[in-house]
């Protein structure tokens, strides 16, 4: 799986999305979890409804949401109020009985606050990235990595 | 029980090459990306170069770059350090030292050590 | 390459002190730094991951904290088995780099 690096903000809200098969996915509940480094567990933050049905109710768990448009297949994960401690690499997935197929791989970055110059020193301005080699930018706020790319970056 | 069991000390003259293991007990190292660090008499630690063994792929600081060559046999879960060219500066302890990668890994695993001597 | 400087590079305390130990990142480094505990003769431990998280066994006197470029180690109350050289370490990207270590001595 490629990586695909979303960055926030700091204090601010982060919004992630993870394209994926409707068809392959039609009736499986989804999950986002944060992986304890790049070869370890993934941990459970939040998950869709109970309901497949009811996929599209906004679910929360502390200050991250999870909403899946299951017609249209994009899963979306909203992180709330965006901390340096919410860096670091997630997963969303897709679940069939105990198992989970992983959607997409995230890498979250956070941000300093331009107009917050009292942590200025605490947090990372955008500019080149410092995770990835010769990452591909998409947008604004997220970019991939392309196959066979290792994340040259962060530690334990 | 889980852990990093490596070969033993080794006293080499300088020029020659030293391949020093780490065998991993209680774990497959195809999970886990294997580090190479070693710490010089009285210094701190330095970080050599690392292995995922799953992928066979491997990276190194540029220091070490073409002078060190970290590999693993997956079927024997054995990490290993070959040093060339080795010079009296190389004496050292050498640590091989396994984990989850970045990102947060909460695993954490160190051999015993290997001292490695150069000297004429 | 990113370079991690400690301070002190030692110190003297006695059991039951609070001692902290700093360490700054040459570039932003996010929450990326790990706390490392070495004994003379033996492998280094972690205690810290990410900053602030502590790492399993390790006991709750030990604190970590920052982010970006500057971290603190905090030992809350100082016990016997603490005296040890303590290094920091980022792993915001490769080549992973230690700090030059401090070493705690008894006073």
């Known amino acids: 799986h490629n990586t695909t690096v979303f960055q926030g903000v700091a204090g601010q809200s982060l919004q992630v999305s993870c394209p994926y098969d409707s068809m392959k996915h039609w009736g499986r509940r989804k999950a986002w979890c944060r992986q304890l480094g790049e070869k370890g567990p993934c941990q459970r933050v939040v998950s869709t409804h109970n309901l497949w049905l009811l996929s599209f109710l906004r679910r929360w768990n502390g200050s991250t949401a999870i909403t899946d448009d299951t017609l249209g297949g994009t899963l979306t994960i909203t992180l709330r109020n965006l901390q340096p401690h919410d860096a670091g690499l997630y997963q969303c997935q897709s679940l069939h009985g105990s198992e989970a197929d992983t959607l997409r791989k995230v890498l979250v970055e956070v941000l300093a606050d331009p107009l917050d110059h009292r942590d200025a020193g605490d947090l990372w301005f955008p500019g080149e990235s410092e995770s990835f080699e010769d990452a591909h930018v998409e947008h604004s706020i997220s970019r991939s990595l392309l196959e066979g790319e290792i994340p040259f970056p962060p530690t334990s | 029980q889980v852990q990093l069991v490596q070969s033993g000390a080794e006293v080499k003259k300088p020029g020659a090459s030293v391949k020093v293991s780490c065998k991993a007990s209680?774990?497959?190292?195809?999970?886990?990306?294997i580090h190479w660090v070693r710490q010089a008499p009285g210094q701190g630690l330095e970080w050599m170069g690392w292995?995922?063994?799953?992928?066979?792929?491997?990276k190194y600081a540029p220091k070490f770059q073409g002078r060190a060559t970290i590999t693993a046999d997956t079927s024997t879960s054995t990490a290993y350090m070959e040093l060339s060219s080795l010079r009296s500066e190389d004496t050292a302890v050498y640590y091989c030292h396994a984990d989850h990668g970045n990102y947060g890994s909460t695993m954490d695993y160190w051999g015993q050590g290997t001292l490695v001597t150069v000297s004429s | 390459d990113i370079q991690m400087t400690q301070s002190p590079s030692s110190l003297s305390a006695s059991v039951g002190d609070r001692v902290t130990i700093t360490c700054h990142a040459s570039?932003?480094?996010?929450?990326?730094l790990s706390w490392y505990q070495q004994k003379p003769g033996k492998a280094p431990k972690l205690l810290i991951y990410?900053?602030?998280n502590l790492h399993t066994g390790v006991p709750s006197r030990f604190s970590g904290s920052g982010s970006g470029t500057d971290f603190t180690l905090t030992i809350s109350s100082l016990q016997p088995e603490d005296f040890a050289t303590y290094y920091c370490q980022q792993g915001q990207t490769y080549p992973r780099t230690f700090g030059q270590g401090t070493k705690v001595e008894i006073k």
């Open positions: 990410k900053a602030s």
């Open positions: 209680g774990f497959s190292i195809e999970d886990f990306y």
């Open positions: 292995i995922d063994p799953e992928q066979g792929e491997s």
């Open positions: 570039q932003h480094i996010n929450v990326w």
